[in-house]
Protein backbone atom coordinates (compact mmCIF):
# COMPACT_ATOMS: atom_id res chain seq x y z
CA UNK A 1 0.00 0.00 0.00
CA UNK A 2 1.47 3.34 -1.08
CA UNK A 3 1.19 6.38 1.22
CA UNK A 4 -0.58 9.48 -0.13
CA UNK A 5 2.80 11.17 -0.52
CA UNK A 6 4.18 8.26 -2.57
CA UNK A 7 1.04 8.31 -4.75
CA UNK A 8 1.43 12.06 -5.29
CA UNK A 9 5.07 11.57 -6.25
CA UNK A 10 4.27 8.77 -8.70
CA UNK A 11 1.34 10.70 -10.26
CA UNK A 12 3.51 13.73 -10.91
CA UNK A 13 6.30 11.59 -12.36
CA UNK A 14 3.82 9.80 -14.66
CA UNK A 15 2.21 13.03 -15.87
CA UNK A 16 5.68 14.41 -16.56
CA UNK A 17 6.49 11.30 -18.63
CA UNK A 18 3.27 11.76 -20.65
CA UNK A 19 4.03 15.34 -21.63
CA UNK A 20 5.58 15.97 -25.00
CA UNK A 21 9.33 16.36 -25.05
CA UNK A 22 10.39 20.00 -24.79
CA UNK A 23 13.55 21.35 -26.38
CA UNK A 24 16.53 21.30 -24.02
CA UNK A 25 17.10 24.17 -21.62
CA UNK A 26 20.37 25.94 -22.45
CA UNK A 27 20.15 28.83 -19.95
CA UNK A 28 18.39 29.31 -16.66
CA UNK A 29 15.13 31.25 -16.91
CA UNK A 30 14.86 34.63 -15.19
CA UNK A 31 14.70 34.36 -11.36
CA UNK A 32 16.40 30.95 -11.38
CA UNK A 33 19.98 30.47 -10.12
CA UNK A 34 22.42 28.33 -12.04
CA UNK A 35 24.36 25.70 -10.13
CA UNK A 36 26.53 23.75 -12.56
CA UNK A 37 24.16 21.96 -14.96
CA UNK A 38 21.03 22.83 -13.00
CA UNK A 39 18.76 25.79 -12.42
CA UNK A 40 17.47 26.21 -8.87
CA UNK A 41 14.53 28.21 -7.55
CA UNK A 42 14.06 28.83 -3.84
CA UNK A 43 10.52 29.35 -2.54
CA UNK A 44 9.46 32.43 -0.59
CA UNK A 45 6.60 30.74 1.21
CA UNK A 46 6.15 27.56 3.26
CA UNK A 47 4.37 24.31 2.50
CA UNK A 48 4.21 20.65 3.52
CA UNK A 49 6.36 18.36 1.36
CA UNK A 50 3.62 17.14 -0.99
CA UNK A 51 2.39 20.69 -1.70
CA UNK A 52 5.98 21.69 -2.42
CA UNK A 53 6.34 18.76 -4.80
CA UNK A 54 3.17 19.82 -6.61
CA UNK A 55 4.17 23.48 -6.73
CA UNK A 56 7.49 22.71 -8.42
CA UNK A 57 5.60 20.83 -11.10
CA UNK A 58 3.61 23.99 -11.90
CA UNK A 59 6.99 25.52 -12.79
CA UNK A 60 7.78 22.56 -15.08
CA UNK A 61 10.42 21.50 -12.58
CA UNK A 62 10.88 19.02 -9.74
CA UNK A 63 11.88 19.17 -6.11
CA UNK A 64 15.67 19.24 -5.87
CA UNK A 65 17.54 16.00 -6.48
CA UNK A 66 21.06 15.84 -5.07
CA UNK A 67 23.55 13.49 -6.71
CA UNK A 68 26.30 13.45 -4.11
CA UNK A 69 27.92 15.18 -1.15
CA UNK A 70 29.70 17.63 -3.42
CA UNK A 71 26.44 18.84 -4.97
CA UNK A 72 24.91 19.10 -1.49
CA UNK A 73 27.72 21.40 -0.32
CA UNK A 74 27.43 23.61 -3.41
CA UNK A 75 23.66 23.87 -2.91
CA UNK A 76 24.08 24.71 0.77
CA UNK A 77 26.49 27.48 -0.19
CA UNK A 78 23.58 29.21 -1.97
CA UNK A 79 21.51 29.28 1.24
CA UNK A 80 21.96 32.67 2.91
CA UNK A 81 19.83 32.26 6.01
CA UNK A 82 21.24 30.06 8.77
CA UNK A 83 18.12 28.63 10.40
CA UNK A 84 15.96 28.03 7.33
CA UNK A 85 15.02 24.56 6.12
CA UNK A 86 14.13 23.58 2.54
CA UNK A 87 12.39 20.46 1.28
CA UNK A 88 14.19 18.42 -1.35
CA UNK A 89 12.89 15.55 -3.47
CA UNK A 90 13.60 12.71 -1.04
CA UNK A 91 11.15 10.95 1.26
CA UNK A 92 10.84 7.69 3.16
CA UNK A 93 9.21 4.86 1.22
CA UNK A 94 7.32 2.72 3.72
CA UNK A 95 6.86 -0.13 1.24
CA UNK A 96 10.60 -0.33 0.53
CA UNK A 97 11.73 0.85 3.98
CA UNK A 98 14.29 3.14 2.41
CA UNK A 99 14.85 6.76 1.43
CA UNK A 100 13.63 7.24 -2.11
CA UNK A 101 14.20 10.13 -4.52
CA UNK A 102 11.18 11.35 -6.47
CA UNK A 103 12.79 10.04 -9.68
CA UNK A 104 12.43 6.51 -8.26
CA UNK A 105 16.05 5.89 -7.27
CA UNK A 106 17.13 5.08 -3.73
CA UNK A 107 19.49 7.08 -1.59
CA UNK A 108 23.07 5.89 -1.55
CA UNK A 109 23.69 5.80 2.20
CA UNK A 110 27.06 7.54 1.81
CA UNK A 111 25.66 10.58 -0.02
CA UNK A 112 23.87 12.44 2.79
CA UNK A 113 24.33 12.30 6.55
CA UNK A 114 20.72 12.55 7.67
CA UNK A 115 19.88 13.78 11.15
CA UNK A 116 16.70 12.18 12.45
CA UNK A 117 14.69 9.03 11.94
CA UNK A 118 13.92 7.04 8.80
CA UNK A 119 10.24 6.30 9.30
CA UNK A 120 6.78 6.66 7.80
CA UNK A 121 5.80 10.21 6.79
CA UNK A 122 9.39 11.41 6.93
CA UNK A 123 10.77 13.71 4.26
CA UNK A 124 14.19 15.28 3.84
CA UNK A 125 15.08 18.92 4.28
CA UNK A 126 18.39 20.70 4.00
CA UNK A 127 19.75 23.78 5.73
CA UNK A 128 22.91 25.80 5.28
CA UNK A 129 24.83 23.18 7.28
CA UNK A 130 22.83 19.96 7.65
CA UNK A 131 20.37 17.42 6.27
CA UNK A 132 17.31 16.58 8.37
CA UNK A 133 14.49 14.07 8.47
CA UNK A 134 11.26 15.95 9.22
CA UNK A 135 7.58 15.05 9.32
CA UNK A 136 6.36 15.58 5.76
CA UNK A 137 3.54 17.74 7.14
CA UNK A 138 6.04 20.30 8.48
CA UNK A 139 5.61 23.67 6.76
CA UNK A 140 8.95 24.90 5.43
CA UNK A 141 10.38 26.35 2.23
CA UNK A 142 11.51 24.24 -0.69
CA UNK A 143 13.87 24.18 -3.70
CA UNK A 144 12.81 23.41 -7.27
CA UNK A 145 15.22 22.35 -10.01
CA UNK A 146 15.36 22.23 -13.79
CA UNK A 147 18.13 20.37 -15.60
CA UNK A 148 20.19 22.30 -18.14
CA UNK A 149 20.88 20.47 -21.37
CA UNK A 150 24.61 20.12 -21.98
CA UNK A 151 25.63 21.65 -25.31
CA UNK A 152 27.32 18.98 -27.37
CA UNK A 153 29.77 19.99 -30.09
CA UNK A 154 28.67 18.72 -33.48
CA UNK A 155 31.18 16.43 -35.16
CA UNK A 156 31.44 17.01 -38.90
CA UNK A 157 32.81 14.34 -41.20
CA UNK A 158 36.08 15.21 -42.97
CA UNK A 159 35.38 17.00 -46.23
Amino acid sequence: QKSSIEKCSVDIQQSRNKTTERPGLLNCPIYWQQLREKCLLFSHTVNPWNNSLADCSTKESSLLLIRDKDELIHTQNLIRDKAILFWIGLNFSLSEKNWKWINGSFLNSNDLEIRGDAKENSCISISQTSVYSEYCSTEIRWICQKELTPVRNKVYPDS
Epitope: I30, Y31, L41, F42, S43, H44, T45, V46, N47, P48, N51, D55, K59, R80, D81, I84, E139, I140, R141, C144
Partner: antibody, heavy 120, light 107 residues
Framework: QVQLVQSGAEVKKPGASVKVSCKAS????????MNWVRQAPGQGLEWMGL????????YYNQKFKDRVTMTRDTSISTAYMELSRLRSDDTAVYYC?????????????WGQGTTVTVSS | DIQLTQSPSFLSASVGDRVTITCKAS??????VVWYQQKPGKAPKLLID???IRHTGVPSRFSGSGSGTEFTLTISSLQPEDFADYFC?????????FGGGTKLEIK
Protein backbone atom coordinates in the same frame (compact mmCIF):
# COMPACT_ATOMS: atom_id res chain seq x y z
CA GLN B 1 -9.99 43.39 -8.84
CA VAL B 2 -7.80 42.32 -5.93
CA GLN B 3 -8.86 43.96 -2.68
CA LEU B 4 -7.57 43.58 0.87
CA VAL B 5 -9.82 45.26 3.44
CA GLN B 6 -8.53 45.57 6.99
CA SER B 7 -10.33 46.07 10.31
CA GLY B 8 -10.59 49.49 11.94
CA ALA B 9 -8.24 51.45 14.19
CA GLU B 10 -7.50 50.15 17.69
CA VAL B 11 -6.36 51.82 20.91
CA LYS B 12 -4.75 49.46 23.43
CA LYS B 13 -3.05 49.65 26.80
CA PRO B 14 0.51 48.37 27.29
CA GLY B 15 0.50 44.63 28.00
CA ALA B 16 -2.73 44.02 26.07
CA SER B 17 -3.16 42.17 22.76
CA VAL B 18 -4.54 43.32 19.44
CA LYS B 19 -5.98 41.23 16.59
CA VAL B 20 -6.15 42.79 13.13
CA SER B 21 -8.12 41.20 10.28
CA CYS B 22 -7.60 41.36 6.52
CA LYS B 23 -10.43 40.25 4.22
CA ALA B 24 -9.38 39.30 0.70
CA SER B 25 -11.53 39.44 -2.43
CA UNK B 26 -11.08 39.41 -6.20
CA UNK B 27 -8.72 36.41 -6.26
CA UNK B 28 -8.26 32.90 -4.86
CA UNK B 29 -7.41 33.52 -1.20
CA UNK B 30 -5.61 30.19 -0.82
CA UNK B 31 -3.49 30.80 -3.90
CA UNK B 32 -1.31 33.58 -2.46
CA UNK B 33 0.71 33.92 0.72
CA MET B 34 -0.27 36.77 3.05
CA ASN B 35 2.34 38.87 4.83
CA TRP B 36 2.11 41.47 7.56
CA VAL B 37 4.19 44.65 7.49
CA ARG B 38 4.10 47.54 9.94
CA GLN B 39 5.05 51.21 9.75
CA ALA B 40 5.69 53.19 12.92
CA PRO B 41 5.00 56.97 12.77
CA GLY B 42 7.57 58.66 10.55
CA GLN B 43 9.47 55.40 10.15
CA GLY B 44 10.17 52.91 7.39
CA LEU B 45 8.43 49.60 6.82
CA GLU B 46 9.12 46.48 8.91
CA TRP B 47 8.24 42.95 7.81
CA MET B 48 6.59 40.83 10.54
CA GLY B 49 5.94 37.45 8.95
CA LEU B 50 3.79 35.41 6.60
CA UNK B 51 1.02 32.85 6.49
CA UNK B 52 0.25 30.49 3.63
CA UNK B 53 -3.59 30.48 3.59
CA UNK B 54 -3.66 27.19 1.72
CA UNK B 55 -1.84 25.17 4.37
CA UNK B 56 -1.90 27.49 7.37
CA UNK B 57 1.89 27.40 7.60
CA UNK B 58 3.58 30.44 9.10
CA TYR B 59 7.03 32.01 9.27
CA TYR B 60 7.75 34.95 11.57
CA ASN B 61 10.42 37.59 11.80
CA GLN B 62 12.50 36.50 14.83
CA LYS B 63 11.94 39.93 16.37
CA PHE B 64 8.21 39.16 16.78
CA LYS B 65 8.35 35.36 17.09
CA ASP B 66 7.30 35.22 20.76
CA ARG B 67 4.51 37.79 20.45
CA VAL B 68 2.88 37.36 17.05
CA THR B 69 0.36 34.79 15.82
CA MET B 70 -0.90 34.70 12.25
CA THR B 71 -4.01 32.69 11.42
CA ARG B 72 -6.59 32.50 8.66
CA ASP B 73 -10.18 31.46 8.03
CA THR B 74 -10.45 30.20 4.46
CA SER B 75 -14.26 30.05 4.63
CA ILE B 76 -14.39 33.86 4.79
CA SER B 77 -11.09 34.57 2.96
CA THR B 78 -9.68 36.40 5.95
CA ALA B 79 -6.19 36.53 7.47
CA TYR B 80 -5.51 37.62 11.04
CA MET B 81 -2.50 38.97 12.87
CA GLU B 82 -2.48 39.01 16.66
CA LEU B 83 0.26 40.83 18.56
CA SER B 84 0.46 40.30 22.31
CA ARG B 85 2.19 42.05 25.23
CA LEU B 86 1.91 45.38 23.46
CA ARG B 87 4.40 48.16 24.16
CA SER B 88 4.29 51.83 23.27
CA ASP B 89 6.77 51.23 20.43
CA ASP B 90 4.23 48.88 18.79
CA THR B 91 2.21 51.98 17.90
CA ALA B 92 2.12 51.77 14.11
CA VAL B 93 0.04 51.24 11.00
CA TYR B 94 -0.23 47.50 10.33
CA TYR B 95 -0.65 46.32 6.73
CA CYS B 96 -1.52 42.96 5.26
CA UNK B 97 0.26 42.49 1.94
CA UNK B 98 -0.09 39.72 -0.64
CA UNK B 99 3.06 37.97 -1.81
CA UNK B 100 3.01 38.27 -5.61
CA UNK B 101 4.73 34.96 -6.32
CA UNK B 102 5.66 31.85 -4.32
CA UNK B 103 9.26 32.27 -5.47
CA UNK B 104 9.85 36.00 -5.07
CA UNK B 105 9.52 38.29 -2.08
CA UNK B 106 7.56 41.25 -3.46
CA UNK B 107 4.12 42.44 -2.37
CA UNK B 108 1.73 43.23 -5.20
CA UNK B 109 -1.39 44.20 -3.20
CA TRP B 110 -1.73 45.84 0.17
CA GLY B 111 -4.55 46.48 2.62
CA GLN B 112 -5.43 50.06 3.52
CA GLY B 113 -3.69 49.71 6.89
CA THR B 114 -4.91 49.51 10.48
CA THR B 115 -3.68 52.08 12.99
CA VAL B 116 -2.84 50.55 16.36
CA THR B 117 -2.12 53.01 19.16
CA VAL B 118 -0.59 51.70 22.38
CA SER B 119 -0.96 54.18 25.20
CA SER B 120 -1.55 54.09 28.94
CA ASP C 1 20.10 41.67 8.85
CA ILE C 2 20.68 43.41 5.53
CA GLN C 3 20.44 47.18 5.88
CA LEU C 4 19.16 49.29 3.00
CA THR C 5 20.19 52.94 2.95
CA GLN C 6 18.23 55.25 0.69
CA SER C 7 19.44 58.61 -0.50
CA PRO C 8 18.44 61.32 -0.53
CA SER C 9 15.92 61.21 2.33
CA PHE C 10 14.20 64.29 0.88
CA LEU C 11 14.13 65.49 -2.69
CA SER C 12 12.54 68.63 -4.12
CA ALA C 13 11.87 68.65 -7.84
CA SER C 14 9.57 70.14 -10.46
CA VAL C 15 7.14 68.61 -12.93
CA GLY C 16 9.10 67.42 -15.96
CA ASP C 17 12.35 66.86 -14.02
CA ARG C 18 14.33 63.66 -14.19
CA VAL C 19 15.01 62.32 -10.69
CA THR C 20 17.09 59.42 -9.38
CA ILE C 21 16.80 57.74 -5.97
CA THR C 22 19.53 55.43 -4.72
CA CYS C 23 19.30 52.37 -2.48
CA LYS C 24 22.50 50.85 -1.06
CA ALA C 25 22.55 47.41 0.55
CA SER C 26 24.93 46.43 3.33
CA UNK C 27 25.58 43.09 1.55
CA UNK C 28 25.23 41.73 -1.97
CA UNK C 29 21.53 41.13 -2.69
CA UNK C 30 21.85 40.20 -6.35
CA UNK C 31 18.83 41.68 -8.11
CA UNK C 32 16.28 40.80 -5.42
CA VAL C 33 15.21 44.42 -4.95
CA VAL C 34 11.76 45.97 -5.12
CA TRP C 35 10.61 49.60 -5.30
CA TYR C 36 7.32 50.91 -3.89
CA GLN C 37 5.54 54.26 -4.04
CA GLN C 38 3.50 55.43 -1.06
CA LYS C 39 1.21 58.43 -0.91
CA PRO C 40 0.21 60.02 2.43
CA GLY C 41 -2.31 57.91 4.33
CA LYS C 42 -2.24 55.20 1.66
CA ALA C 43 -0.75 51.74 1.35
CA PRO C 44 2.46 51.24 -0.64
CA LYS C 45 2.10 50.45 -4.34
CA LEU C 46 4.46 48.09 -6.18
CA LEU C 47 6.48 49.76 -8.94
CA ILE C 48 9.45 47.53 -9.76
CA ASP C 49 10.56 43.99 -8.94
CA UNK C 50 13.84 42.17 -9.53
CA UNK C 51 15.66 45.54 -9.61
CA UNK C 52 14.42 46.52 -13.07
CA ILE C 53 11.13 44.81 -13.99
CA ARG C 54 8.18 47.20 -14.05
CA HIS C 55 4.99 45.87 -12.50
CA THR C 56 1.89 45.69 -14.70
CA GLY C 57 0.35 49.10 -15.27
CA VAL C 58 3.33 51.11 -14.02
CA PRO C 59 4.14 53.97 -16.43
CA SER C 60 7.32 53.62 -18.50
CA ARG C 61 8.77 56.81 -16.98
CA PHE C 62 9.66 54.67 -13.95
CA SER C 63 12.76 52.54 -14.38
CA GLY C 64 15.02 50.60 -12.04
CA SER C 65 18.59 49.42 -12.37
CA GLY C 66 21.46 47.98 -10.42
CA SER C 67 22.70 44.73 -8.93
CA GLY C 68 24.81 43.65 -6.00
CA THR C 69 24.74 46.49 -3.49
CA GLU C 70 23.72 49.59 -5.45
CA PHE C 71 20.31 50.24 -6.98
CA THR C 72 18.55 53.20 -8.51
CA LEU C 73 14.99 54.19 -9.24
CA THR C 74 14.69 56.81 -11.98
CA ILE C 75 11.63 58.83 -12.94
CA SER C 76 12.39 60.24 -16.37
CA SER C 77 9.88 63.10 -16.41
CA LEU C 78 8.06 63.85 -13.17
CA GLN C 79 4.28 64.07 -13.28
CA PRO C 80 2.15 65.76 -10.57
CA GLU C 81 0.95 62.37 -9.31
CA ASP C 82 4.54 61.16 -8.71
CA PHE C 83 5.10 63.33 -5.65
CA ALA C 84 5.11 60.72 -2.88
CA ASP C 85 7.39 58.58 -0.69
CA TYR C 86 9.49 55.86 -2.32
CA PHE C 87 10.84 52.76 -0.57
CA CYS C 88 13.21 50.01 -1.66
CA UNK C 89 13.03 46.46 -0.28
CA UNK C 90 15.30 43.44 -0.54
CA UNK C 91 14.33 39.76 -0.55
CA UNK C 92 17.74 38.20 -1.02
CA UNK C 93 17.34 36.83 2.50
CA UNK C 94 14.11 35.67 4.09
CA UNK C 95 14.20 38.51 6.59
CA UNK C 96 12.84 41.09 4.18
CA UNK C 97 14.07 44.60 4.93
CA PHE C 98 13.14 48.04 3.62
CA GLY C 99 15.00 51.28 3.04
CA GLY C 100 14.19 54.31 5.17
CA GLY C 101 12.34 56.00 2.31
CA THR C 102 12.73 59.06 0.10
CA LYS C 103 10.19 61.86 0.27
CA LEU C 104 9.77 63.44 -3.16
CA GLU C 105 8.26 66.94 -2.84
CA ILE C 106 7.23 69.64 -5.30
CA LYS C 107 9.81 72.43 -5.54
Amino acid sequence: QVQLVQSGAEVKKPGASVKVSCKASGYSFTGYTMNWVRQAPGQGLEWMGLINPSSGGTYYNQKFKDRVTMTRDTSISTAYMELSRLRSDDTAVYYCARLGDNYRGYFDSWGQGTTVTVSS
Amino acid sequence: DIQLTQSPSFLSASVGDRVTITCKASQDVGTAVVWYQQKPGKAPKLLIDWASIRHTGVPSRFSGSGSGTEFTLTISSLQPEDFADYFCQQYSTYLYTFGGGTKLEIK
